[in-house]
């Protein structure tokens, strides 16, 4: 009985992100397994979150919108290993929107859904950022590794969106 | 006070090159970015490139891609557009301007008095 | 790309009176609250003279009866009393994604 609604609970659950989301890959996890936590068919999953990457060509307000619609915002980096991750689906020869950007130019750089800016888990290439008229943050291929460059935002890149998992 | 000259505009056949020039003077020329804008004979106004302050970032429009190279010679002030493989279309005046940016934006706030370049036979 | 699409191509208005020049974008220009949209300037023989940036903000040393307004996809400059060295084209333009795109332009006259 106990089991029988739990599905149920489940299946109206499913439904209800249907709507928003036509399909769902979902895991089970914790340590009875008896929760499944769920991305967007084809988003990647890395621990809590799902990521998407989008070769649509767009500006950073562009960009961001386009992940707003589905519930997500540009990517926000906030170890290392996150970035290990992301740049595995990546191409090396693109450029990405990260959710990071600098909209006075005070170099008072700022993610997307507030997190703390702090410059000791930043990924910069060398010499970067380098211009406070580059307002927005990209992550690219250079000198034999990926890293973060200062970039004007309204010149249209890929991007990166993220998502916190759906659990049922 | 802000100075743009241009120079180097001219006669061209179609297929041919030509190397424009902006002298700037007035501002610190090593911090801006900076655009060149084209405007065809009694026609509206056109964005052809732009290259950040330390020059190594640039961006053009397709219509140029492939075609026109921006540069810039911080030492000298000086900012540059190598125009290849010309058509007639690009019978224009030309003018250079300073960037400034608007929060995600940005506006185009000083012009030079421009260059004229024919693309004729 | 971003269309601008800026009406009327001309206009003619007595001295001292209100012009009005509108401009619509084929998509949204907006993020955060700004709306980024230019207004340039150009007097025959001369150079564009920037306006208006974001949509309403006066530049520096233009004369306050020129205003912008609008969000969204929908812009208008306005000149509320016409003056003879008003007589010039005006352009907006986009700067929220390259390339960035001007409007057709609109000749102002006086009648």
């Known amino acids: 009985n106990f089991m029988y609604s739990k599905t149920v609970k489940r299946l109206s659950k499913l439904q209800e992100y249907q709507q928003y989301y036509p399909s769902l890959t979902c895991v089970m996890e914790g340590k009875d397994m008896e929760d499944w936590s769920c991305c967007p068919t084809p988003w990647t999953s890395f621990q809590s979150s799902c990521y998407f990457i989008s070769t649509v060509m767009q500006s950073w307000t562009k960009s961001q919108n386009n992940c707003s619609v589905m519930g997500a915002d540009l990517v926000v980096i906030n170890t290392k290993e996150e970035q290990d991750f992301i740049t595995q689906n990546l191409k090396i020869n693109s450029a990405y929107f990260l959710g990071l950007s600098d909209p006075k130019g005070w170099r008072h750089w700022q993610w997307v859904d507030q997190t703390p800016y702090n410059k000791n888990v930043t990924f910069w290439h060398s010499g970067e950022p380098n211009s406070p008229d580059e307002r927005c943050a990209i992550i690219n291929f250079r000198s034999e590794e990926w890293g973060w460059n200062d970039v004007h935002c309204h010149v249209p890149q890929k991007s990166i969106c993220k998502m916190k998992k759906i659990y049922i | 006070e802000v100075q743009l000259l241009e120079s180097g505009g001219g006669l061209v056949q179609p297929g041919g090159s030509l190397r424009l020039s902006c002298a700037a003077s007035?501002?610190?020329?090593?911090?801006?970015?900076m655009s060149w804008v084209r405007q065809a004979p009694g026609k509206g106004l056109e964005w052809v490139a732009t290259i950040n302050s330390g020059g190594d970032n640039t961006y053009y429009p397709d219509s140029v891609k492939g075609r026109f190279t921006i540069s810039r010679d911080n030492s000298k002030n000086t900012l540059y557009l190598q125009m290849n493989s010309l058509r007639a279309e690009d019978t224009a005046v030309y003018y250079c301007?300073?960037?400034?940016?608007?929060?995600?934006?940005?506006?185009?706030?000083?012009w030079g008095q421009g260059t004229t370049v024919t693309v004729s036979s | 790309d971003i269309v601008m699409t800026q009406s009327p191509d001309s206009l003619a208005v007595s001295l001292g009176e209100r012009a009005t020049i509108n401009c619509k974008a084929s998509?949204?220009?907006?993020?955060?609250?700004?709306?980024?949209v230019n207004w340039y300037q150009q007097k025959p023989g001369q150079p564009p003279k920037l306006l208006i940036y974001?949509?309403?903000n006066l530049e520096s040393g233009v004369p306050d009866r020129f205003s912008g307004s609008g969000s969204g996809t929908d812009f208008t400059l306005t000149i509320s009393s016409l003056q003879a060295e008003d007589v010039a084209v005006y352009y907006c333009q986009q700067s929220d994604e390259d390339p960035w795109t001007f409007g057709g332009g609109t000749k102002v006259e006086i009648k």
């Open positions: 974001g949509a309403s």
């Open positions: 301007a300073t960037y400034r940016p608007y929060y995600y934006g940005s506006v185009l706030d000083y």
């Open positions: 998509q949204s220009v907006d993020y955060d609250g700004n709306s980024y």
């Open positions: 007035g501002f610190t020329f090593s911090t801006y970015t």
